[in-house]
């Protein structure tokens, strides 16, 4: 006999990086004929929502009209049919944006480089922060995390093709409280390099330290939920 | 103490040549970059040099008129410039590992003074 319902799915929109005092909706959604839902934000229960009527609802949304550095950390979600519990969602990391300062974003050797040059992002802020992130926007956008004073680098390795796109980065105060955005660069890369070398025995930036997450909502991928569930937002973990 | 000297600059027939160089000295870069800058306007990228390899890359502008090349054992960075133009009058300056900004320039810790390039049609 199953003692508990499969874990519901739980996202942020129309995004989990919320500027501060703008609002967002933490949606939940389980199984229809769930008749209570649970919000839980820090491992404490957060917001309770009951539908009705609830065979005829499978999702619920809780509503934070004004952004702040409180209401960031982690979320989860629960719901109940009859007497029995789900398991818990995945933990949704709802982050605040456009706190204090804002950084640059440099990058070496260049915006237009040649596939196999070596490329290296650099995101500096001179407040009190000693957390980078550096997001490539898209689809499936990527976070990568650095450290340093006032400054962290991001080598990309010898870059190809899947390279291009637009880059930001962000200070990260706390976890969970970010900066304003860089203002964007674009990186092109182009062709390949012809006759030279570029130091192949240099380490490339492993990969294992590249987290792949659902930034856009343009395409409505933040509706396909079991690629949300998937990537999980695991974004600081 | 970390120094960029550039030379080579002077005047020049419109369709001649001139090679500037930069001398590096003080530690080892990655790349050395050249700029230029003409009156009243904003400082622009023309070449990039790699160190190691010799990768190089070319402001659309200038490929093919122009080649960036290196001599590891003297640490010095030539600029060849051939076919030149009058739009090519400027200062031409050196910069080590330079990066390009957010703010859409390129900055760096170590500039050279510059050279005058000057063109006459």
């Known amino acids: 006999q199953q003692q508990t319902l499969p874990k519901p799915f739980i996202w942020a929109e129309p995004h989990f990086m919320v500027p501060k005092e703008k609002q967002v909706t933490i949606c939940c959604q389980g199984n229809y004929g769930a008749v209570e839902y649970q919000l839980h934000f820090e491992g404490s229960l957060f917001a309770v929502d009951r539908p009705k009527p609830p065979e005829r609802i499978n999702k619920v949304q809780f509503y934070i009209p004004d952004m702040n550095s409180r209401m960031a950390g982690q979320y989860s979600c629960i719901y109940r049919v009859g007497e029995l519990w789900s398991e818990p969602s995945n933990l949704l990391d709802l982050v605040v944006t456009e706190m204090y300062d804002t950084p640059t974003l440099s990058v070496h050797p260049g915006p237009e480089v040649i596939s196999g040059e070596k490329v290296t992002f650099y995101c500096r802020l001179d407040t009190a922060t000693s957390m980078f992130l550096l997001l490539k926007e898209g689809r499936s956008s990527h976070v990568q995390r650095g450290y340093g004073k006032v400054q962290a680098e991001f080598p990309l390795g010898p870059v190809t093709t899947a390279h291009r796109g637009t880059y930001r980065c962000f200070g990260s105060y706390n976890n969970h409280a970010w900066s304003f955005p860089s203002e964007p660069v674009k990186l092109l890369v182009t062709g390949d390099i012809e006759n030279t070398s570029l130091a192949p025995e240099d380490p490339t930036f492993p990969a294992d330290t590249w987290g792949t997450y659902l930034l856009t909502t343009e395409t409505g991928l933040q509706k396909d939920h079991a690629l949300w569930d998937h990537t999980a937002q695991n974004l600081l973990r | 103490q970390v120094q960029l000297v550039e030379s080579g600059g002077g005047m020049v027939q419109a369709g001649g040549s001139l090679r500037l160089s930069c001398a590096a000295s003080?530690?080892?870069?990655?790349?050395i970059h050249w700029f230029r800058q003409a009156p009243g306007k904003e400082r622009e990228f023309v070449a990039r040099?790699?160190?190691?390899?010799?990768?190089?890359f070319y402001a659309d502008s200038v490929k093919g008129r122009f080649t960036i090349s290196r001599d590891n054992t003297e640490n010095l960075v030539y600029l060849q410039m051939n076919s030149l133009k009058p739009e090519d009058t400027a200062v031409y300056y050196c910069?080590?590992?330079?990066?390009?900004?957010?703010?859409?320039?390129?900055?760096?810790?170590?500039w050279g003074p510059g050279t005058q390039v000057t063109v006459s049609s």
């Open positions: 003080g530690r080892t870069f990655n790349t």
């Open positions: 910069a080590a590992d330079a990066r390009y900004t957010s703010h859409g320039y390129y900055e760096s810790d170590y």
């Open positions: 040099i790699w160190w190691i390899g010799g990768a190089t």
